[in-house]
């Protein structure tokens, strides 16, 4: 999947653009908004009818090295009595994000952008009753 | 930066941390090959905390289109299909990394940017504060 070129109708390439070798791009990994903090609603992962836990995945050859993944706690959803309702299902909500992968080939190093699917949380759904024979 | 284990046989000049600027291949590797997007494509309608998806487009960013979730109701949908206001629909937010063209309008020069997106909604029990 290639990053789309800027359409000429919208932009002209400015003279100030840095020279870049063919087939690659220059990437500054000093993150814009690095210090913005998420004001997460208070522990929604425990108060949800489809509660979830968080696990941290760590990979030193990935930037960022830490990626947090959610895992639904139950198969069913939690009803008003605090019991699991198995006629409903807790399903994962997922979102793609980008990471930079560092690859070692012998003593040389290359960098590759990767799309990673992150499970963000869970929601309670009614399954489609659609039996396939 | 983060520390990288180095091949002990390699010259010692290599920096252990990720450099501030890197050259990366234009092709983006997709690790999500084992997922079926059709399966979750209509959770927004079938959830007890349904949401609408709004298109956020920015040609200076990659991906240029990001879909933002907005919860449809304050309450959650009960077994009878009615909105139950004893429960709350709340957005699930996630910080994701995108590419920002920098300098602006340049085709092959980017900077990573962290943005906050609402991915979907979940139904929660409200925290009840009893005022004495």
């Amino acid at each position: 999947r290639k990053i789309p070129k800027v359409g000429h109708t919208f932009f002209q390439k400015p003279e100030s653009c840095p020279p870049v070798p063919g087939g690659s791009m220059k990437l500054d990994i000093g993150i814009i908004n690095e210090n913005q903090r998420v004001s997460m609603s208070r522990n929604i992962e425990s108060r949800s009818t489809s509660p979830w836990n968080y696990t941290v995945t760590w990979d030193p050859n990935r930037y960022p090295s830490e990626v947090v993944q959610a895992q639904c706690r139950n198969l069913g959803c939690i009803n008003a009595q605090g019991k699991e309702d198995i006629s409903m299902n807790s399903v994962p909500i997922q979102q793609e994000t980008l990471v930079v992968r560092r690859k070692h080939q012998g003593c040389s190093v290359s960098f590759q952008l990767e799309k990673v699917l992150v499970t963000v949380g869970c929601t309670c759904v009614t399954p489609v009753i659609h039996h396939v024979q | 930066g983060i520390t990288i284990p180095r091949n002990p046989g390699c010259p010692n000049s290599e920096d252990k941390n990720f450099p501030r600027t890197v050259m990366v291949n234009l092709n983006i590797h997709n690790r999500n090959t084992n997922t079926n997007p059709k399966r979750s494509s209509d959770y927004y309608n079938r959830s007890t905390s349904p949401w609408n998806l709004h298109r956020n487009e920015d040609p200076e960013r990659y991906p240029s289109v990001i879909w933002e979730a907005k919860c449809r109701h304050l309450g959650c949908i009960n077994a009878d299909g009615n909105v139950d206001y004893h429960m709350n629909s709340v957005p699930i937010q996630q910080e994701i990394l995108v590419l920002r063209r920098e300098p602006p309008h340049c085709p092959n020069s980017f900077r990573l940017e962290k943005i906050l997106v609402s991915v979907g909604c979940t139904c929660v029990t409200p925290i009840v504060h009893h005022v004495a």
Partner: antibody, heavy 123, light 106 residues
Framework: EVQLQQSGPELVKPGASVKISCKTS????????MHWVKQSHGKRLEWIGG????????SYNQNFKGKATLTVDKSSSTASMELRSLTSEDSAVFYC????????????????WGQGTSVTVSS | QIVLTQSPAIMSASPGEKVTMSCSAS?????MHWFQQKSGTSPKRWIY???KLASGVPARFSGSGSGTSYSLTITDMEAEDAATYYC?????????FGAGTKLELI
């Protein structure tokens, strides 16, 4: 063709633990739930619990909480169940059984079964 | 938990005979599901969502019922139908099975 291949029979001593496995083929392992069912003396079936590899969700019958632990290994498309602190009451045939995907069918909608693993607890 | 009571526990039928077995739930359920098990083999999905026949199940089988009362019927008993039939519900946690009805061939 959907297949659930369970590990072989086990003879274990009281107080010990046992782990039985269920290797799957013929479908996308991640997308479907795996349940475990106990059958004592060729009679009543008792649901132990289920696990969904994609969502990470698990659900246990209260009667088996602390007795059974369900896990999955996505890389080998294998589900496993560990039973601990075994007593003679735990002697039974244990089945893995595929449940729904939470999308087309409910997670608890069981369709395919493994051939069963016999566990005998005896000193 | 919902207790499923199957009756009769054991029954016999001749080839060609009509067979009906029942499953009573201690609380109302939306659907009932049935599994067939022959001696020494694993159970097979037989009827789901009260009345839908699983793939490969002969049309002589049918399921019906609602609320707390459900049944499985065979219009013309055949030798291969001799087995134990279990009803099952997943309307309420935990998922439960009945004790089974053993159907024997006369």
């Amino acid at each position: 063709e959907v297949q659930l291949q369970q590990s072989g029979p086990e003879l274990v001593k009281p107080g010990a633990s046992v782990k039985i496995s269920c290797k799957t083929s013929g479908y996308t392992f991640n997308e479907y739930t795996m349940h475990w069912v106990k059958q004592s003396h060729g009679k009543r079936l008792e649901w132990i619990g289920g696990i969904n590899p994609n969502s990470g969700g698990v659900s246990y019958n209260q009667n088996f909480k602390g007795k059974a632990t369900l896990t999955v290994d996505k890389s080998s498309s294998t589900a496993s169940m560990e039973l601990r602190s075994l007593t003679s009451e735990d002697s039974a045939v244990f089945y893995c059984a595929r449940g729904g995907d939470g999308y087309y069918t409910n997670y608890f909608d069981i369709d395919y079964w493994g051939q069963g693993t016999s566990v005998t607890v005896s000193s | 938990q919902i207790v499923l009571t199957q009756s009769p526990a054991i029954m016999s039928a001749s080839p060609g005979e009509k067979v009906t077995m029942s499953c009573s739930a201690s609380s109302s359920v939306n659907y009932m599901h049935w599994f067939q098990q022959k001696s020494g083999t694993s159970p097979k999905r037989w009827i789901y969502d009260t009345s839908k026949l699983a793939s490969g199940v002969p049309a002589r089988f049918s399921g019906s019922g609602s609320g707390t009362s459900y049944s499985l019927t065979i219009t013309d008993m055949e030798a291969e139908d001799a087995a134990t039939y279990y009803c099952q519900q997943w309307n309420s946690h935990p998922l439960t099975f009945g004790a089974g009805t053993k159907l024997e061939l006369i």
